[in-house]
């Protein structure tokens, strides 16, 4: 019962976590720039992994997708990759874990198979969660370092002057969603791995049982395993088993190089 609960809870926690990772990846507010009063109106800038947005105090909002794939910083590409890998692994993990759930019966699937699937999905959730946490952390590090905004400077560009305005970007809501979601997916994965231990059938020491005809005893000869009925002379037989069934444990063992049973 505890195993089923652990597995079920692990699945639900992972499901919420992966939904959060997807939400964070799609969100535009990965980095935000505090409202600043430009000469016209208050403007709020924010960016995601896929596009950049501007919102005015009037409520007008405009977003534009990042222009080129090749022109983007390697770090941003890495964050995108980590988040996508996290989503893909998480989605596969969810699919596997659905079939692994103890409360769901699929044909004559054995507990050992379910245990293996639970472990597989658990590992996938753990890796998925780690990918999300890593991706969000890399992006957060990019914001903290502020490598492009060391000083406000002016330089000549094509068609005129370009002035870099001193500004500060802060953590957006998506970063916190990503961290929490990654953590939940990670916890869910750990729970699935714990549940796997309870699902795996313990190795049972099955005792060998020998059945014989109750009418007479069967003797095994070392030379080719020829059985005699026991009515004649039994001088060469090493062991004679009486009728009925006995387990190996019940039979006294005598050390012999011909001890086959």
């Amino acid at each position: 019962m505890a195993v089923t609960a652990c597995q079920g809870l692990g699945f639900v926690v992972s499901l919420i976590g992966i939904a959060g990772i997807i939400a964070a990846t799609c969100m535009d507010q990965w980095s935000t720039q505090d409202l600043y009063n430009n000469p016209v109106t208050a403007v709020f800038n924010y960016q995601g992994l896929w596009r950049s947005c501007v919102r005015e105090s009037s409520g007008f909002t405009e977003c534009r997708g990042y222009f080129t794939l090749l022109g983007l910083p390697a770090m941003l590409q890495a964050v995108r990759a980590l988040m996508i890998v996290g989503i893909v692994l998480g989605a596969i993990g969810l699919l596997v874990s659905i079939f692994a759930l103890k409360c769901i019966r699929i044909g004559s699937m054995e507990d050992s198979a379910k245990a293996n699937m639970t472990l597989t999905s658990g590992i996938m959730f753990i890796v998925s969660g780690l990918c999300a946490i890593a991706g969000v952390s890399v992006f957060a590090n990019m914001l903290v370092t502020n490598f492009w905004m060391s000083t406000a400077n002016m330089y000549t560009g094509m068609g005129g002057m370009v002035q870099t305005v001193q500004t500060r970007y802060t953590f957006g809501a998506a970063l916190f969603v990503g961290w929490v979601a990654g953590g939940l997916t990670l916890i869910g994965g750990v729970m699935m791995c714990i549940a796997c231990r309870g699902l795996a059938p313990e190795e049972t020491n099955y005792k060998a049982v020998s059945y014989h005809a109750s009418g007479h005893s069967v003797a095994y000869k070392p030379g080719g395993f020829k059985a005699s009925t026991g009515f004649g002379s039994n001088t060469k037989n090493k062991k004679i088993y009486d009728g009925g069934a006995r387990t190996e444990d019940e039979v006294q063992s005598y050390p012999s190089k011909h001890d086959y049973v």
């Epitope: 016209v40 800038n45 924010y46 007008f60 405009e62 534009r64 222009f67 983007l72 910083p73 870099t164």
Partner: nanobody, 121 residues
Framework: EVQLVESGGGLVQPGGSLRLSCAAS????????AGWYRQAPGKERELVAL???????TYGASLKGRFTISSDNAKDTVYLQMSSLQPDDTAVYYC???????????????WGQGTQVTVSP
């Protein structure tokens, strides 16, 4: 890289009109606002008019409603309609776009090379 191309400047008689335009091209992300500044010989650069993407506008104090700024968001172009021009409107008019690149490069002000407007009888 972002390029700004200005046009429409020239010589005009007092009381006349001109329409300046400035088109931005290149890798443009979030435009915070666009507009015009001017610099007369021997004077500092001053604000003429600015407009946001949402249409909010602001004008320089000395213009007395003679100038009108407008924009075409689809074309990333800003226009300045100047009427009742006076000799003291003679200056180099600079186009300005404030673009936010966020994590890709921060907040940047782009300036055009300027277009000369001369008001002379």
């Amino acid at each position: 890289e972002v390029q700004l191309v200005e046009s429409g400047g020239g010589l005009v008689q007092p009381g006349g009109s001109l329409r300046l335009s400035c088109a931005a091209s290149g890798n443009i992300l979030s435009i915070n606002y666009a507009g015009w500044y001017r610099q007369a010989p021997g004077k500092e650069r001053e604000l003429v008019a600015l407009i946001t993407r949402g249409g909010s506008t602001t004008y320089g104090a000395s213009l007395k409603g003679r100038f009108t700024i407008s924009s075409d968001n689809a074309k990333d172009t800003v226009y300045l309609q100047m009427s009742s021009l006076q000799p003291d409107d003679t200056a180099v008019y600079y186009c300005n776009f404030r673009i936010n690149f966020g994590i890709l490069g921060g907040l940047r002000d782009y300036w055009g090379q300027g277009t000369q407007v001369t008001v002379s009888p």
